[in-house]
């Protein structure tokens, strides 16, 4: 099994611009979990999806920032316009 | 029924510490962000604060972090907000909000805080 | 800080009366929400994402815009309607708000 599988790896982009992380969870998991991670303020549970419904976006206030689940096997998660602070890592998790 | 009811509020000397709490009943509130706004007497809504269901985003605003401090009980159904070195322009009335809607869908009916010597 | 600039602060108008708020953000945000206070109540919401009416609101409220401009409109003024309203951004934290516009009987 591949795993859970993000694109890009990286990102490089000018303030302003907007942004779009993909994720593909691992195939028969019904859960799947957009978390940020920065120095400053650790591990953020931005939004989490059940069978495809966002369940909890409140990680997530800032409306530049908008996740999709389309179907069981892809998620974006899209930020709009970016901001300098948004530089972070960004995981996408998945689980049954 | 969503119900939001804010207590702890009342008259503080400035420099003094008080905790605000808000009771949410109606919704769960375990995964739901909240927020924190308050309004001093003739004046407009100003936004204080906000955290996410399960605490791990916060956010404040600027010229009140390092005095105030959001936090939640889940399992009490409650958001507080501890405020510390309180100063007399921190007067207001305190609201708790629900984020609903991309914003604010629904709020306590405020409780008072009077910061004065 | 993303300043919300509201006009008029104040405005006199009659029942029936069409009416019109505006709110200019000092950086553009995605969207617009609206909140409607009257005196000693907590601020109810109208109108979020823009153009969308909250849950009970009457058809007469509507909400437009985009950018840096966005408007509330009151398509016919109720008595009911008298009461000071607020706009908000919710694109980037601080989530600010306009200093609000008292709408007060003619």
């Known amino acids: 099994d591949a795993g859970v599988i993000q694109s890009p790896r990286h990102e490089v982009t000018e303030m302003g611009q907007e942004v779009t992380l993909r994720c593909k969870p691992i195939s028969g998991h019904n859960s799947l979990f957009w978390y940020r991670q920065t120095m400053m303020r650790g591990l953020e549970l931005l939004i989490y999806f059940n069978n495809n419904v966002p369940i909890d976006d409140s990680g997530m206030p800032e409306d530049r920032f908008s996740a999709k689940m389309p179907n069981a096997s892809f998620s974006t998660l899209k930020i709009q316009p970016s901001e300098p602070r948004d530089s972070a890592v960004y995981f996408c998790a998945s689980s049954l | 029924e969503v119900q939001l009811v804010e207590s702890g509020g009342g008259l503080v000397q400035p420099g003094g510490s008080l905790r605000l709490s808000c009771a949410a009943s109606?919704?769960?509130?375990?995964?739901?962000?909240m927020h924190w706004v308050r309004q001093a007497p003739g004046k407009g809504l100003e936004w204080v604060s906000y955290i996410s269901s399960g605490s791990s985003t916060i956010y404040y605003a600027d010229t009140l972090k390092g005095r105030f401090t959001i936090s939640r009980d889940n399992s009490k159904n409650t958001l507080y907000l501890q405020m510390n070195s309180l100063r007399a322009e921190d007067t207001a009335v305190y609201y708790c909000?629900?984020?609903?809607?991309?914003?604010?869908?629904?709020w306590g009916q405020g409780t008072t805080v009077t910061v004065s010597s | 800080d993303n300043q919300l600039t509201q006009s008029p602060s104040f405005l006199s108008a009659s029942v029936g009366d069409r009416v019109t708020i505006t709110c200019r953000a000092s950086s553009s945000v995605n969207y617009i929400y609206w909140y409607q206070q009257k005196p000693g109540k907590a601020p109810k919401l109208l109108i979020y994402?823009?153009?969308n009416l909250a849950p009970g609101v009457p058809s007469r409220f509507s909400g437009s815009g985009s950018g840096n401009e966005y408007t509330l409109t009151i398509s016919s003024l109720q008595p009911e309607d008298f009461a000071t309203y607020y706009c908000?951004?919710?694109?980037?934290?601080?989530?600010?708000f306009g200093q609000g516009t008292k709408l007060e009987i003619k």
């Open positions: 109606g919704f769960t509130f375990s995964n739901t962000g």
């Open positions: 994402y823009t153009s």
């Open positions: 909000a629900r984020r609903g809607e991309g914003a604010m869908d629904y």
């Open positions: 908000q951004q919710f694109t980037s934290s601080p989530f600010t």
